[in-house]
């Protein structure tokens, strides 16, 4: 682990209570193909333990969704990945809207520091799929 | 190669016969910008030769497609990437539907073992594009 | 840097003049979370400085966009990432259309050589968002 190969791939555990837009994640071989090797989970949110540049990737699929599902609901459904703590480093890293689709997927390189906690906020009123091949979130340390 | 930097990027060769939803891939410098360095192809399917955590990525674009093409066809067009053999390890790793779009693209981290064969199943009745900048599939070993 | 860990993540600076479909990028810590460590910018286009296989990724979101924006405009909005110079190596690497969506995001592995300049061409008449969490472009050296 001294090489700094920190890596994690998480699956959706549950959504937050009504006023909390965060998705809550879980990981570990017992759950399927998710894992944490370096980063850790703090109440379902991913915390970074090693400084560096990371590849952050995410896919979120809406539950029992058709191309008309997203247009039925007034508030646009948007997914944002960001650093939510510490507050001094709070920033949105990656943002996507579903529009008339049922899945968003993207990835980006970003510098992260030890102690950064990443939040994935799903705004709107549509429930995400918990299928492990449809909704997942991960990070990979790529260089110092 | 002893470092375990196994990597492959493939281009679409052809679709399967009518009852076979699998996409058949090809790779090699003579074909364009595709390549196999470690993993190998077995009858158009990608076989892993080194244990580890891999970044799997895919983009599939439907041929001569407009936003109405996908909605015209009753059966939803879905792309699933999974381990199809050995049967004991069969699992869906990544799944996306086209809905009203013409392209899906995603990526995920997943543990793979030597001998795992990855299949990319395209269900529905729409033909994928064979353009090498529109449809491609790849894996990258990232850590043990 | 001798390890060959060349990496860059860029944010949109501006679009080109009317007949120039290229997006012009910028990077550096002073601008936000973008950076260049190895590759360099030449008049807003990304130039590779080390041979190898790279993971290229991009996300582009259209400005003030709704699912009807893209269907309102006759000419399809398409994003293509390619090598634009030297001319002898000119090729399209990755191409996506927006159809009824407002964001495209994808990634691929591709061999690049020192001196290759990557261009990102956005065809159509819709303006891309300059928000750093909505539009970004990056490369990561992954192996020789």
């Amino acid at each position: 682990e001294s090489l700094g190969w920190d890596i994690a791939e998480l699956q959706l555990n549950h959504t937050g209570p009504q006023q909390d837009p965060r998705l809550y994640w879980q990981g570990g071989p017992a759950l399927g193909r998710s894992f944490l090797r370096g980063p850790e989970l703090d109440k379902g949110q991913l915390r970074i333990r090693r400084d560096g540049i990371y590849m952050v990737h995410i896919q979120v699929t809406l539950a029992i969704c058709s191309s008309t599902s997203t247009s039925r609901h007034h508030h646009p459904t948007t997914l944002a990945v960001g650093i939510c703590s510490p507050a001094s480093r709070s920033i949105s890293l990656l943002r996507l809207s579903f529009h008339q689709g049922c899945t968003i997927a993207s990835q980006r390189l970003t510098p992260l520091a030890r102690g950064d906690t990443l939040c994935t906020n799903l705004t709107g009123t549509l429930l995400p799929s918990r299928n492990t091949d449809e909704t997942f979130f991960g990070v990979q340390w790529v260089r110092p | 190669e002893s470092l375990g930097w196994d990597i492959a990027e493939l281009q679409l060769n052809h679709t399967g016969p009518q009852q076979d939803p699998r996409l058949y891939w090809q790779g090699g410098p003579a074909l364009g910008r595709s390549f196999l360095r470690g993993p190998e192809l077995d009858k158009g399917q990608l076989r892993i030769r080194r244990d580890g955590i891999y970044m799997v990525h895919i983009q599939v674009t439907l041929a001569i497609c407009s936003s109405t093409s996908t909605s015209r066809h009753h059966h939803p067009t879905t792309l699933a990437v999974g381990i199809c053999s050995p049967a004991s390890r069969s699992i869906s790793l990544l799944r996306l539907s086209f809905h009203q779009g013409c392209t899906i693209a995603s990526q995920r981290l997943t543990p793979l073992a030597r001998g795992d064969t990855l299949c990319t199943n395209l269900t529905g009745t729409l033909l994928p594009s064979r353009n090498t900048d529109e449809t491609f599939f790849g894996v990258q070993w990232v850590r043990p | 840097e001798s390890l060959g860990w060349d990496i860059a993540e860029l944010q949109l600076n501006h679009t080109g003049p009317q007949q120039d479909p290229r997006l012009y990028w910028q990077g550096g810590p002073a601008l936000g979370r973008s950076f260049l460590r190895g590759p360099e910018l030449d008049k807003g286009q990304l130039r590779i400085r080390r041979d190898g296989i790279y993971m290229v990724h991009i996300q582009v979101t259209l400005a003030i966009c709704s699912s009807t924006s893209t269907s309102r405009h006759h000419h399809p909005t398409t994003l293509a990432v390619g090598i634009c110079s030297p001319a002898s190596r000119s090729i399209s690497l990755l191409r996506l259309s927006f159809h009824q969506g407002c964001t495209i995001a994808s990634q691929r592995l591709t061999p690049l050589a020192r001196g290759d300049t990557l261009c990102t061409n956005l065809t159509g008449t819709l303006l891309p968002s300059r928000n750093t969490d909505e539009t970004f472009f990056g490369v990561q050296w992954v192996r020789p």
Partner: antibody, heavy 120, light 111 residues
Framework: EVQLKQSGPGLVQPSQSLSITCTVS????????VHWVRQSPGKGLEWLGV???????DYNAAFISRLSISKDNSKSQVFFKMNSLQADDTAIYYC??????????????WGQGTSVTVSS | DIVLTQSPASLAVSLGQRATISCRAS??????????MHWYQQKPGQPPKLLIY???NLESGVPARFSGSGSGTDFTLNIHPVEEEDAATYYC?????????FGAGTKLELK
């Protein structure tokens, strides 16, 4: 406090139409969908349709030809209209709020119901 | 349409005992990692009241003696210990696809 209050006639002539208004309070129709369900001794609970926050409607295919659901967000009112009623449409008609998640299709608050008898 | 079959049609349970109600769907109502089955309670002269959603999630304000389980096509509502105020008719409802359908109901009486 979330409330749904229904108003409408108790008696409808055969082949005539039924109109019910559901006035809501404690939540906004620009955020939540409203379902219509009826209950009769013979057929139990039957889902009729829903109007979403956007004004888009989904109807039970069995009623689509004679059912219309609309709303006025500013008045917090949802309007239900069913045409060509027959005796077997005699039932209690309910409006009910869709829960927070739009794709969950579950009803967390219900109106008091409107008892409708179809008879000449 | 998905048909929901509830059993038994009625049952009588002593105070403090367990009541178990079953709901079987004509096809799976599980999708996207959830079980799209919900349970309501209805007392005479009142509208239905949501008890449990997504097979096992207790609606806010509902006592913990109510619990739900199941997946695919077979679902169960348990009430333990049964209290006097639990005398009512209980309905299952799926939301896997349109149209939404309900079970015919199970009437719970106290011995």
């Amino acid at each position: 406090e979330v409330q749904l209050k229904q108003s409408g006639p108790g008696l409808v002539q055969p082949s005539q139409s039924l109109s019910i208004t559901c006035t809501v309070s404690g939540f906004s129709l620009t955020t939540y969908g409203v379902h219509w369900v009826r209950q009769s001794p013979g057929k139990g609970l039957e889902w009729l349709g829903v109007i979403w926050s956007t004004g888009i409607t989904d109807y039970n295919a069995a009623f689509i030809s004679r059912l219309s659901i609309s709303k006025d967000n500013s008045k917090s009112q949802v309007f239900f209209k069913m045409n060509s009623l027959q005796a077997d449409d005699t039932a209690i008609y309910y409006c009910a709020r869709n829960s927070y998640y739009g794709n969950l299709y579950v009803m967390d608050y219900w109106g008091q119901g409107t008892s409708v008898t179809v008879s000449s | 349409d998905i048909v929901l079959t509830q059993s038994p049609a009625s049952l009588a349970v002593s105070l403090g005992q367990r009541a178990t109600i079953s709901c079987r769907a004509s096809k799976s109502v599980s999708a996207s990692g959830y079980n799209f089955m919900h349970w309501y309670q209805q007392k005479p002269g009142q509208p239905p009241k949501l008890l449990i959603y997504l097979a096992s999630n207790l609606e806010s304000g509902v006592p913990a003696r109510f619990s739900g389980s199941g997946s695919g096509t077979d679902f169960t509502l348990n009430i333990h210990p049964v209290e006097e105020e639990d005398a009512a008719t209980y309905y299952c409802q799926h939301s896997r696809e349109l149209p939404l359908t309900f079970g015919a109901g199970t009437k719970l009486e106290l011995k």
